[in-house]
């Protein structure tokens, strides 16, 4: 089975690498534009230059192309705590990231939010905080992990998952409550 190709891919595959087929004349292969530029006019004939123009400020192309317009530069999302790591240039999009001691949580493929790395108070660091993953904490005895923080077992209700981890403490509390004063 031949994999289905889009019209653009079909047209490009007829020409050697680095060239594309002229949209009005499929016997002509035009040279693609370099990154940082876009297609202003197709080449007039075989062996003749494609008219490529540099991207304007606020736009870019990151690879060789025959795009009629450059792509708009991304903006870092302040509301998500993002900061600009490197600004947009004609051949590279803006790079956004997080501040020191923060990690990225991806809500979707193209949306991330910056959160502070957990400090593992009342526990120990099992795995250090990384660019895309929070610190992994191991809690001390008498504490359980809730929303990546070590919380005292005194806050563990019977209905919660923590009962397994806090079982001895819960038994002790129950024992204390049950024992009457003599």
């Amino acid at each position: 089975l031949v994999p289905h190709l889009g019209d653009r891919e079909k047209r490009d595959s007829v020409c050697p690498q680095g060239k594309y087929i002229h949209p009005q004349n499929n016997s002509i292969c035009c040279t693609k534009c370099h990154k940082g530029t876009y297609l202003y006019n197709d080449c007039p004939g075989p062996g003749q230059d494609t008219d490529c123009r540099e991207c304007e400020s606020g736009s870019f192309t990151a690879s060789e192309n025959h795009l009629r317009h450059c792509l708009s530069c991304s903006k870092c999302r302040k509301e998500m705590g993002q900061v600009e790591i490197s600004s947009c240039t004609v051949d590279r999009d803006t790079v956004c990231g997080c501040r020191k001691n923060q990690y990225r949580h991806y809500w979707s493929e193209n949306l991330f939010q910056c959160f502070n790395c957990s400090l593992c108070l009342n526990g120990t660091v099992h795995l250090s905080c990384q660019e895309k993953q929070n610190t992994v904490c191991t809690c001390h005895a008498g504490f359980f992990l809730r929303e990546n923080e070590c919380v005292s077992c005194s806050n563990c209700k019977k209905s919660l998952e923590c009962t397994k981890l806090c079982l001895p403490q819960i038994e002790n509390v129950k024992g204390t409550e049950d024992s009457g004063t003599t």
């Epitope: 509301e79 949580h105 939010q113 959160f115 929303e147 990546n148």
Partner: nanobody, 119 residues
Framework: EVQLLESGGGLIQPGGSLRLSCAAS????????MVWVRQAPGKGLEWVSH????????YYADSVKGRFTISRDNSKNTLYLQMNSLRAEDTAVYYC????????????RGQGTLVTVSS
């Protein structure tokens, strides 16, 4: 106490429109970035859209871009989601929420409103 109450869901035919509302109370609404998320039957939560405090910066998931519009009225403490050209795959419970601050979970989220797109 933070309260978020969604309304406006219902049964709608493909191609139709709905406007969801979320009435907020118990916090300073104008200080919070607000989010719409949805949960389709048997699926996880999907981030649909968010809007910053002043309504200037918005974000849309690729699946709803060009069809949904998020807005807010800070004087009425209300968040909106205008949904046009609805598709069967938009069927879900829609929740409004405050943008999480401490970690990737929703401390404050409404009870949700069900949107069913079916002919």
């Amino acid at each position: 106490e933070v309260q978020l109450l969604e309304s406006g869901g219902g049964l709608i035919q493909p191609g139709g429109s709905l406007r969801l509302s979320c009435a907020a109370s118990g916090f300073t609404f104008a200080h919070e970035t607000m989010v719409w998320v949805r949960q389709a039957p048997g699926k996880g939560l999907e981030w649909v859209s968010h809007i910053d405090r002043v309504g200037q910066d918005t974000y849309y998931a690729d699946s709803v871009k060009g069809r949904f519009t998020i807005s807010r009225d800070n004087s009425k403490n209300t968040l909106y989601l205008q949904m046009n050209s609805l598709r069967a795959e938009d069927t879900a419970v829609y929740y409004c929420a405050q943008l999480p601050k401490r970690g990737p979970w929703f401390d404050y989220r409404g009870q949700g409103t069900l949107v069913t797109v079916s002919s």
